[in-house]
Interface confidence: low
């Protein structure tokens, strides 16, 4: 359906509040270094213009595309050249190249200070003084740090943020009420950002076929009672929504997401019995709820897959007639029967099935050739099962912090060229898989663990793409989306790596260590651990454990001393000397 004025169409569909929020998110994700006030000014200008178009769709410039309107607005920023350097060159381009140029300059690791949480009373005063500005600031700060955050979902987070302050700023103990809620929003927000980043990477690096395959598998697990046609329709619509959001088309994305939620709620009977409680909620909550909905129960009478996909003499004919539909149906049928498999495993199985048909349908006796195809799946299934089993055992034995350390050592040995902050961030997050997934029942462990690991490893891939330093990382990240995790798992100690020269400065610590939070202390220790492994990649577990135990004892001793700084100055060099001797 065509509209005279796209901006008027979206303003009317979304309403002023969501329109303004989404434009602020879009601008903040593109120009991540711009001050808040500058963005608010741009958003207000766009909103006033949109209102004139609502009043008269034939008014001047109202017929322009959103990319043209938004791009023109961004290019009015006076400090573009000095703040963003070559990104300013985007403004010399015409649409659609200009928008593509802005997208390419999104920075996954912007040089922004970490957000510091003010005192609760300070936050509550700011909230009460100007609620609208307070919430806009939240959208701005999150969006500029997470340039691929799923915009309509960020509006949902902002609504929860508002609700937390509205409730807790009136509570007797404001801090006890508010801080756990803010911690939860922060952790959920980081997880949401990382999940969306994988979706965008999937679309941008591997194309919509890869995303659609992921979506077929995941939705078939969630909605095993739905017909293939229904799943396909949802996949088509979901792909459009995420393509738009990943492409910076946030108004279209939010509008289409709302349409998809409406469709799902109107067609619950042919999708899933689990949608009912989501569909009674308001829009933002409803869309979130639908995205997170639990898997429906599997139909009781599903027949064996072998009849249609192995035993049938028509397999090659059906495959040849419409490869993607046939493979899509195979993936749908396999996934709806296996909620206990990770999506990535299901995609590997579909890939293996496709490879077998490509080979066998050209053979003299195709049926004989593909008759054992399901047997070939066994090792593919067992590999992640064993990986989850071994790592959950290790997690239960060590606890989260030491499990993270084990992964830090493992990954630093695999890819020692990667920067220390990246190795620490990624390994800490890989280590969180234990607490997240190992407590779950057996049938939920693999989908939880492997699909979470895919999200974390994607973070490694996007950071590495910005500053590539390791051919091994590039290879694992770019060759196959579904085989990324097995590729990283298979990496061994990098024998070609030249150990980093010892730098005493790296292992010099001061009294400020004592005032750090527990998490910050862990990060400091883990940073030192990575540097140790980079210096001595062949150090044994026992050697590294000895050094780390000594380190913990040395820090504890000096933090208890009367003159902490003097203790660090005296004991530090002794610790360094002892460590060098232990690793020699």
């Amino acid at each position: 359906d065509t509209h005279k004025s796209e901006v008027a169409h979206r303003f009317k569909d979304l309403g002023e509040e969501h329109f303004k929020g989404l434009v602020l998110v879009a601008f903040s994700q593109y120009l991540q270094q711009c001050p808040f006030e500058e963005h608010v000014k741009l958003v207000n200008e766009v909103t006033e213009f949109a209102k004139t178009c609502v009043a008269d769709e034939s008014a001047e410039n109202c017929d322009k595309s959103l990319h043209t309107l938004f791009g023109d607005k961004l290019c009015t920023v006076a400090t573009l050249r000095e703040t963003y350097g070559e990104m300013a060159d985007c403004c010399a381009k015409q649409e659609p190249e200009r928008n593509e140029c802005f997208l390419q300059h999104k920075d996954d690791n912007p040089n922004l200070p970490p957000l510091v949480r003010p005192e609760v009373d300070v936050m509550c005063t700011a909230f009460h003084d100007n609620e609208a500005t307070f919430l806009k600031k939240y959208l701005y700060e999150v969006a500029r740090r997470h340039p691929y955050f799923y915009a309509p979902e960020l509006l949902f987070f902002a609504a929860r943020y508002k609700a937390a302050f509205a409730e807790c700023c009136q509570a007797a103990d404001k801090a006890a009420c508010l801080l756990p809620k803010l911690d939860e929003l922060r952790d959920e927000g980081k997880a949401s950002s990382a999940k969306q980043r994988l979706k965008c990477a999937s679309l941008q690096k591997f194309g919509d076929r890869a995303f659609k395959a992921w979506a077929v598998a995941r939705l078939s697990q969630k909605f095993p009672k739905a017909e293939f046609a229904e799943v396909s329709k949802l996949v088509t619509d979901l792909t459009k929504v995420h393509t738009e959001c990943c492409h910076g088309d946030l108004l279209e994305c939010a509008d289409d997401r709302a349409d998809l939620a409406k469709y799902m709620c109107e067609n619950q009977d042919s999708i899933s019995s689990k949608l009912k409680e989501c569909c009674d909620k308001p829009l933002l909550e409803k869309s979130h709820c639908l995205a997170e909905v639990e898997n429906d129960e599997m139909p009781a009478d599903l027949p064996s897959l072998a009849a249609d996909y192995v035993e049938s003499k028509d397999v090659c004919k059906n495959y040849a007639e419409a490869k993607d539909v046939f493979l899509g149906m195979f993936l749908y049928e396999y996934a709806r029967r296996h909620p206990d498999y990770s999506v990535m495993l299901l995609l590997r199985l579909a890939k293996a099935y496709e490879a077998t048909l490509e080979k066998c349908c050209a053979a003299a006796d195709p049926h004989e050739c593909y008759a054992k195809v399901f047997d070939e799946f066994q090792p593919l299934v067992e590999e992640p099962q064993n990986l989850v089993k071994q790592n959950c055992e290790l997690f239960e034995q060590l606890g989260e912090y030491k499990f993270q350390n084990a992964l830090l050592v493992r990954y630093t040995k695999k890819v020692p060229q990667v920067s220390t902050p990246t190795l620490v961030e990624v390994s800490r997050n890989l280590g969180k898989v234990g607490a997240k997934c190992c407590k779950l029942p057996e049938a939920k462990r693999m989908p939880c663990a492997e699909d979470y690991l895919s999200v974390v490893l994607n973070r490694l891939c996007v950071l590495h793409e910005k500053t590539p330093v390791s051919e091994k990382v590039t290879k694992c990240c770019t060759e196959s989306l579904v085989n990324r995790r097995p590729c990283f798992s298979a990496l061994e100690l990098d024998e070609a790596y030249v150990p980093k020269a010892f730098n005493a400065e790296t292992f010099t610590f001061h009294a400020d260590m004592c005032t750090l939070s527990e998490k910050e202390k862990q990060v400091k220790k883990q940073t030192a651990l990575v540097e140790l492994v980079k210096h001595k990649p062949k150090a044994t577990k026992e050697q590294l454990k000895g050094v780390m135990d000594n380190f913990a004892a040395f820090v504890e001793k000096c933090c208890k001393a009367d003159d902490k700084e003097a203790c660090f100055a005296e004991e530090g060099p002794k610790f360094v000397a002892a460590s060098q001797a232990a690793l020699a």
Epitope: F228, A229, S232, K233, T236, D314, V325, M329
Partner: nanobody, 115 residues
């Protein structure tokens, strides 16, 4: 609810013609390739013809090439199969499916060709 309802079948003399229709509802018809499949008495389903979502690319089983024509009207959400020069071996229940599936999701329409 996804629904496919076929019509247009009947009894016809060998050499005659029929035009089958399939009315679709409950899904975005214009987003999917569609097929005609038939099942003769006592036999398994046999794929007959397919058409892509835009109605550009059409494909036919060897046994019907040159005699049958598949088409679609996305505005009307309807799939068609024009069958000319019918033979007794074309006798079967004909049903439309989404994509290239040969799994029946509908009742079908009976075509009987007498010699």
């Amino acid at each position: 609810q996804v629904q496919l309802v076929e019509s247009g079948g009947g009894l016809v003399q060998a050499g005659g013609s029929l035009r089958l229709s399939c009315a679709a509802s409950g899904f975005t018809f214009g987003s999917f390739g569609m097929s005609w499949v038939r099942q003769a008495p006592g036999k398994g389903p046999e794929w007959v013809s397919a058409i892509d979502s835009g109605g550009v690319d059409t494909r036919y089983a060897e046994s019907v090439k040159g005699r049958f024509t598949i088409s679609r009207d996305n505005a009307k959400k309807t799939l068609y199969l024009q069958m000319n020069s019918l033979k007794p071996e074309d006798t079967a229940v004909y049903y439309c499916t989404i994509g290239q599936s040969t799994s029946r999701g509908s009742q079908g329409t009976q075509v009987t060709v007498s010699s």
